[in-house]
Amino acid sequence: VSLRIQEGCSHLPSCCPSKEQEPPEEWLKWSSASVSPPEPLSHTHHAESCRASKDGPLNSRAISPWSYELDRDLNRVPQDLYHARCLCPHCVSLQTGSHMDPLGNSVPLYHNQTVFYRRPCHGEEGTHRRYCLERRLYRVSLACVCVRPRVMA
């Protein structure tokens, strides 16, 4: 499906006429798109510990380990985004993998991702059964990094 950007509103073909309760096929294809985390998410409850693993995915081996948290909006493309959540306030020692080093801080690395929101077309709410895709930047934390603390002057 091609996108046309028009005055801040991205239209699917014909600005997407659709019937209530019957989503057009294009929308179902679009809305089911998601940005998956590098590793599958576990939906079980578990206490995520502040430690660097010896094996496993990057996010658990890092000295600033993080977990992924779901951000779901059915009216957004992509529908699912994953935010990195730092598991430690400081960085983990490379030697032990568990002791924290107060000389380093574990902080999220942010990225402004382009997303599209499904909206009524401007000035047409409640009239034509059409919708528009509005392009926006959305802040997502990609990973956690180990940084030296800022020194206040």
């Epitope: 659709s18 309760q21 989503p23 948290e69 779901l70 951000d71 779901r72 009216n75 935010h83 919708y131």
Partner: antibody, heavy 125, light 108 residues
């Protein structure tokens, strides 16, 4: 038409596990965008959202209660089950299940558009 | 977590009165939803996506607002409108549904 009905014990003792079942008809929980949530209301108090399960089995829980809650679905039986472990008298409430997933021309709604009649659960020693 | 604060918590009104209930969010949100609940009954959807009336809801009900401030207005109170009203929002990250503490509308 869409109907939902909650079932479960009416009286529990503290520390026991509460298992509530929502049996629904008139829609399918395998339809993209569909979801079902549990909401409770202590006597004379406000509504409190507890948990939600989507068509694709993704689950969300109220953060403060996450360790005690589990939500599951059986699409073939048209049922959603909520379990609450280690109940306390403060868990005494009317428990509702409600559907979410109404699709309009402009997108999905996050309103609970259909509700069950609720089931009163009392926790007392 | 986003908090919702409804005001007032209690409101006495007469038939024919114009009534406004406010719902304030602790941070900016896209949409607000409103429900009506009568004693011993399940909540009933009233307004979805801030300003759209749910099916079968009389036109005397209306919703408006943006950002952190949202309102539910009843243009002319009717006897069947005396009930408790709740606002609700959905937050996508982390995915949570939040309700206001309710506004009880009583007959003056």
């Amino acid at each position: 038409q869409v109907t939902l009905k909650e079932s479960g014990p009416t009286l529990l003792k503290p520390t026991q596990t509460l298992t509530l079942t929502c049996t629904f008809s008139g829609f399918s929980l395998s339809t993209s965008g569909m979801g079902l949530g549990w909401i409770r209301q202590p006597p004379g108090k406000a509504l409190e959202w507890l948990a939600h399960i989507w068509w694709d089995d993704v689950k969300h829980y109220k953060p403060a209660l996450k360790s005690r809650l589990t939500i599951t679905k059986d699409t073939s039986k048209n049922q959603v089950v909520l379990t609450i472990t280690n109940v306390d008298p403060v868990d005494t409430a009317t428990y509702y299940c409600a559907r979410m997933g109404q699709l309009h021309y402009y997108g999905y709604d996050y309103a609970m558009d259909y509700w069950g009649q609720g089931t009163l659960v009392t926790v007392s020693s | 977590d986003i908090q919702l604060t409804q005001s007032p918590s209690f409101l006495s009104a007469s038939v024919g009165d114009r009534v406004t209930i406010t719902c304030s969010a602790s941070s900016s949100v896209s949409y607000m939803y409103w429900y009506q609940q009568k004693p011993g009954k399940a909540p009933k959807p009233l307004i979805y996506r801030t300003s759209n009336l749910a099916s079968g809801v009389p036109s005397r009900f209306s919703g408006s607002g943006s950002g952190t401030e949202y309102t539910l207005t009843i243009s002319s109170m009717q006897p069947e409108d005396f009930a408790t009203y709740y606002c609700q929002l959905y937050h996508s990250y982390p995915p949570t549904w939040t309700f206001g503490q309710g506004t009880k509308l009583e007959i003056k």
